[in-house]
């Protein structure tokens, strides 16, 4: 169909309760383009009509509420007047049990579920809260350890909880609840967040660490687009360079002629301590010599690689 | 002893800018929240902007949304406020406060005071 | 936002007579009060915060009491240097917000 397929990473959601995600990837978003999404490489678009359970809402795909059936890989297709990019995601669906100190913690959870407060300063935890405009968020109210919070050293702005003179007692299973208000309908939202107490500034000390990949291999098609993302949390007056090498060499010195290969525009997000930094690898077009290579993530002294594979045949297929 | 010190204060007109700075001394600066508070001539107090140790949390008033900016330099014990597309209901005595408990205010500089007049 | 009302605007005393001073929010703001004095020609000084608690050095004779929406700023007898500008503060909601405050004048 002539749409380039990009994969983007895992998302761990919630059941039972309303998921957005945002069909956003610069600059293919940013000019004049038509956005439409499909569940598991189904032909027929998710629904537009608002009063369903899962449907399109702009560039988004929104989920009023999630259920344990949603998990699977949702694509949206970005057409341009001359291009048109097939984005995969793969959206995975867990039962939330906040509450219950039985289950143990949940693996891979984002910085968004795992925040840090520090000893003795004037801190604040997040509630990352996105959905699209359609969507109307009422006040945010904070627990912790399944109570509600009260108290003279806690106050709400906005989406944070602003915690005066941190102590050691303050870690543990934050929770913040919002009730969000679609077409009428009200939906609860409810996001956990594994609070750590550090005493110094710094994320790690000076060592920035990568987050992702993690010296791994990625399955890849033959002639596919694949772009794959660094990320890098460091200290916010960091120096360390961000970059993706190969042999030893610059992806964009490397593919200097062909261009196949290139390095994107670094982004970061701020955080209470420390910066996430994203930067990614593009591949046009996977070709056989990519394969077994590793394509290094480099921060500062720390590294860490992906090396590209064929996927496994199908045997179905025959 | 704790102290701050407002600087940057001057006569501007309408529609120009105008960036203020605080030296912060005696006290741990890189642990507390930072705010700007002003006092028009004669009038009571009006908080206008607040910023987190890190940078990380930063609001304001309504009255300067989209038109002022905090920031601060922790290096430097620094606090900053910069003020664009002035207005004159901007004139004020414009104080530098610690936060104490976020978002009471226990130390206080003496104040840079902002004219903005055509 | 949150208004904070204060009264009286005016408080005329003498010296050793005690000073009542009230400040009304339009909603309740819990135990997230505090109160200021201003001297002339000086910044303000942070005197009570969360309602009754003394900050650094503020003498005994100034306490604060109340809760919700209504609260009191008391100065159990006044000295000379008392006589000045007070302001309450509110930081239960964003923005924070000032009464417009009282002057105690001596009479």
């Known amino acids: 169909d002539g749409c380039k397929d990009i994969f983007m990473k895992n998302e761990i959601l919630s059941a039972s309760q309303p998921f957005a995600f945002n069909c956003t990837f610069p600059p293919i978003t940013s000019g004049e383009v038509s956005v439409t999404w499909y569940k598991n490489s189904s032909k027929i678009p998710v629904s537009k009509i608002i009063q369903s359970r899962i449907h399109q809402d702009e560039t988004w795909i929104l989920f009023l509420p999630m259920e344990w059936g949603d998990s699977g890989v949702y694509q949206c297709v970005i057409k341009g007047r001359d291009s048109c990019h097939r984005i995969h995601v793969n959206l995975t669906v867990f039962e939330k049990h906040w509450c219950d100190t039985s289950i143990g913690g949940l693996p891979n959870l984002s910085d968004e579920y795992k925040q840090i407060l520090h000893l003795g300063k004037d801190d604040s935890l997040t509630c990352h809260l996105h959905f699209p405009k359609s969507c109307v968020l009422g006040p945010i109210k904070w627990y912790k350890d399944c109570n509600e919070i009260k108290g003279e050293r806690f106050t709400v702005l906005e989406t944070r909880l602003l915690v005066s003179n941190v102590s050691a007692e303050d870690r543990g299973n934050y929770a913040c609840q919002a009730i969000l208000t679609h077409s009428g309908k009200q939906y609860e939202v409810l996001n956990g967040i594994t609070v750590s107490i550090t005493e110094r500034a710094g994320y790690g000390g000076s060592v920035p660490k990568i987050i992702y990949p993690k010296n791994h291999s990625i399955e890849v098609q033959l002639g596919t687009t694949l772009i794959v993302d660094c990320n890098v949390t460091d200290t916010k007056d960091n120096t360390n360079l961000r970059c993706w090498r190969v042999n030893n060499t610059l992806v964009d010195d490397y593919y200097d002629e062909s261009k196949r290969i290139r390095e994107g525009v670094e982004t970061h997000v701020s955080f209470r301590e420390h910066n996430l930094y994203t930067v990614n690898i593009t591949f046009l077009e996977v070709k056989m010599e990519d394969y077994g290579l590793p394509f290094m993530c480099h921060a500062g002294v720390s590294t860490a690689y992906i090396i590209l594979q064929l996927p496994a045949p199908d045997f179905r297929a025959y | 002893e704790v102290q701050l010190v407002e600087s940057g204060g001057d006569l501007v007109q309408p529609g120009r800018s105008l960036r203020l700075s605080c030296a912060a001394s005696?006290?741990?600066?890189?642990?507390?929240?930072m705010h700007w508070v002003r006092q028009a001539p004669g009038k009571g107090l009006e908080w206008v902007s607040v910023?987190?140790?890190?940078?990380?949390?930063?609001a304001y008033s309504d009255s300067v949304k989209g038109r002022f900016t905090i920031s601060r330099d922790n290096a430097k014990n620094s606090l900053y406020l910069q003020m664009n597309s002035l207005r004159t209901e901007d004139t004020a005595l414009y104080y530098c406060?610690?936060?104490?408990?976020?978002?009471?205010?226990?130390?206080w500089g003496q104040g840079t005071l902002v004219t903005v007049s055509s | 936002e949150i208004v904070l009302t204060q009264s009286p605007a005016t408080l005329s005393l003498s010296p050793g007579e005690r000073a009542t001073l009230s400040c009304r929010a339009s909603q309740s703001i819990s135990s997230y009060l505090a109160w200021y004095q201003q001297k002339p020609g000086q910044a303000p000084r942070l005197l009570i915060f969360n309602v009754a608690n003394r900050a650094t050095d503020i003498p005994a004779r100034f306490s604060g009491s109340g809760s919700g929406t209504d609260f009191t700023l008391t100065i159990s007898s006044l000295e000379p240097e008392d006589f000045a500008v007070y302001y309450c503060?509110?930081?239960?909601?964003?923005?924070?917000?000032f009464g417009g405050g009282t002057k105690v004048e001596i009479k």
């Open positions: 910023i987190s140790w890190n940078s990380d949390v930063i």
């Open positions: 005696g006290f741990t600066f890189d642990d507390y929240a």
């Open positions: 406060t610690k936060g104490h408990k976020w978002s009471f205010f226990d130390y």
């Open positions: 503060q509110q930081r239960s909601n964003w923005p924070l917000t």
